[in-house]
């Protein structure tokens, strides 16, 4: 956020940039939280995203029986590993094809017994406030589908008729990790020392990190003809003085006619 300065007063302005603002020769370059000619004002809204997508990772183990283990499979750069990865990925893409959140699989380790495949199933969904539910449902469908395929695609007389066959009892879900997105926490962190006064409000399922000085939200402070300004003690209304009135009160809603005050003073003198 920048404010340009022209004229002789600029050199004085340079040394007066506040709140970590830096002078670039023309203006104070303000940190994210501030604006104004001297970076003296606190912003009333902070961009907290959200991220376009949220990811989840499921750590799974399956046992492939249609491939015999060889030592080369331990080496991720070997031709054996690459061919196994290709077939396994194709097979899993088929298994999970009906899950819109499915992104792919990542093999982390192959070990003996026939071939025990430690891998991650990667899921992703567009951010909405319900992303946790969406990803929780997707992980349940992953469990169902992998259980089904490892039960159905099995060896018969040491022969597999499918792209891959599995050991029914070798399927395990080790861990599920969902990327945490907490707009409230992000908002509090980015508002720094003003964190107690910034809140998250939703509009069209998008979170907005705002202080009461941001108009148009349910928490917005109505300063009437005054100006809302954030300080370390919270939002305050700076009341204006017009040609005819002084305004006061917490929300600048109390107007006092100057002529009455002057008249009163005049009367006392």
């Amino acid at each position: 956020r920048t404010t340009t300065c022209f004229g002789d007063g600029c050199q004085n302005t340079a040394s007066r940039c506040k709140n970590g603002g830096t002078w670039d020769g023309l203006k104070c370059q303000c940190p994210n939280l501030y604006y104004g000619e001297l970076c003296e004002e606190v912003v009333s809204s902070i961009d907290i995203g959200p991220p376009e997508t949220i990811s989840a990772q499921m750590e799974l183990t399956v046992t492939v029986t249609s491939v015999k283990f060889t030592e080369e499979l331990k080496n991720h750069s070997s031709q054996e590993f690459q061919e196994f990865k290709q077939t396994f990925t194709e097979q899993m893409n088929i298994v999970y094809s009906g899950i819109p959140e499915y992104v792919g699989v990542n093999i982390t380790k192959l070990r003996l017994g026939s071939v025990v495949v430690e891998h991650d199933v990667l899921l992703r969904t567009k951010y909405t406030p319900e992303y946790k539910t969406v990803l929780d449902n997707a992980t349940e469908v992953v469990k169902e589908k992998i259980t089904k395929v490892t039960t159905q695609q099995i060896m018969i007389n040491d022969i597999c008729s499918d792209m891959m066959c599995f050991n029914t009892t070798g399927t395990q879900v080790q861990n599920i990790t969902v990327t945490q997105y907490d707009p409230e926490e992000d908002c509090r962190k980015m508002a720094k020392e003003y964190g107690d006064y910034f809140v998250v409000e939703y509009r069209d399922q998008k979170p907005y990190c705002i202080s009461p000085c941001e108009p148009g939200f349910s928490v917005s402070k109505n300063c009437n003809l005054g100006k809302c300004q954030m300080s370390l003690s919270g939002p305050q209304c700076l009341c204006v003085t017009t040609e005819t009135h002084w305004y006061s009160g917490e929300t600048c809603n109390q107007g006092t006619q100057k002529s009455l005050v002057y008249g009163h003073h005049h009367h006392h003198h």
Epitope: T65, S66, V67, K68, T70, E72, Q79, E80, E83, F84, Q86, T87, E90, M155, D158, I159, C160, S161, D162, M163, M164, C165
Partner: nanobody
Framework: EVQLVESGGGVVQPGGSLRLSCAAS????????WGWFRQAPGKEREAVAL???????FYADSVKGRFTISQDNSKNTLYLQMNSLRAEDTAMYYC?????????????????WGQGTQVTVSS
């Protein structure tokens, strides 16, 4: 990358014999799995005979006792000896390979393929 080139196909009368060859380039011939698949017009590709570096072999029920798969590691060549040929053996025959020790008949699990050689059994 493994390159496979089949030869030996042709037209033969029922009861006749043919020997198919599959020449492989690359240093992977002694390991993994090798196989012969065939595909008749309008039908899916099917496994005919398979062999793995651990000594395992497979023959489709329809060719057992008539076909023999073998390999010559010194020549990097895979063979399919076909005896007592029948009209139903008519198909395009493909050589397939994988560096993995496979136990699957499904063509999707096999990574390397030749262009095929035509076998026609007809009187």
């Amino acid at each position: 990358e493994v390159q496979l080139v089949e030869s030996g196909g042709g037209v033969v009368q029922p009861g006749g014999s043919l020997r198919l060859s599959c020449a492989a380039s690359g240093d992977t011939f002694s390991r993994g799995s090798w196989g012969w698949f065939r595909q008749a017009p309008g039908k899916e590709r099917e496994a005919v005979a398979l062999i793995s570096s651990d000594g395992w072999t497979f023959y489709a029920d329809s060719v057992k006792g008539r076909f023999t798969i073998s390999q010559d590691n010194s020549k990097n060549t895979l063979y399919l000896q076909m005896n007592s040929l029948r009209a139903e053996d008519t198909a395009m025959y493909y050589c397939a390979a994988s560096v993995l020790v496979l136990r699957t008949l499904n063509p999707k699990a096999w990574h390397h393929w030749g262009q095929g050689t035509q076998v026609t059994v007809s009187s």
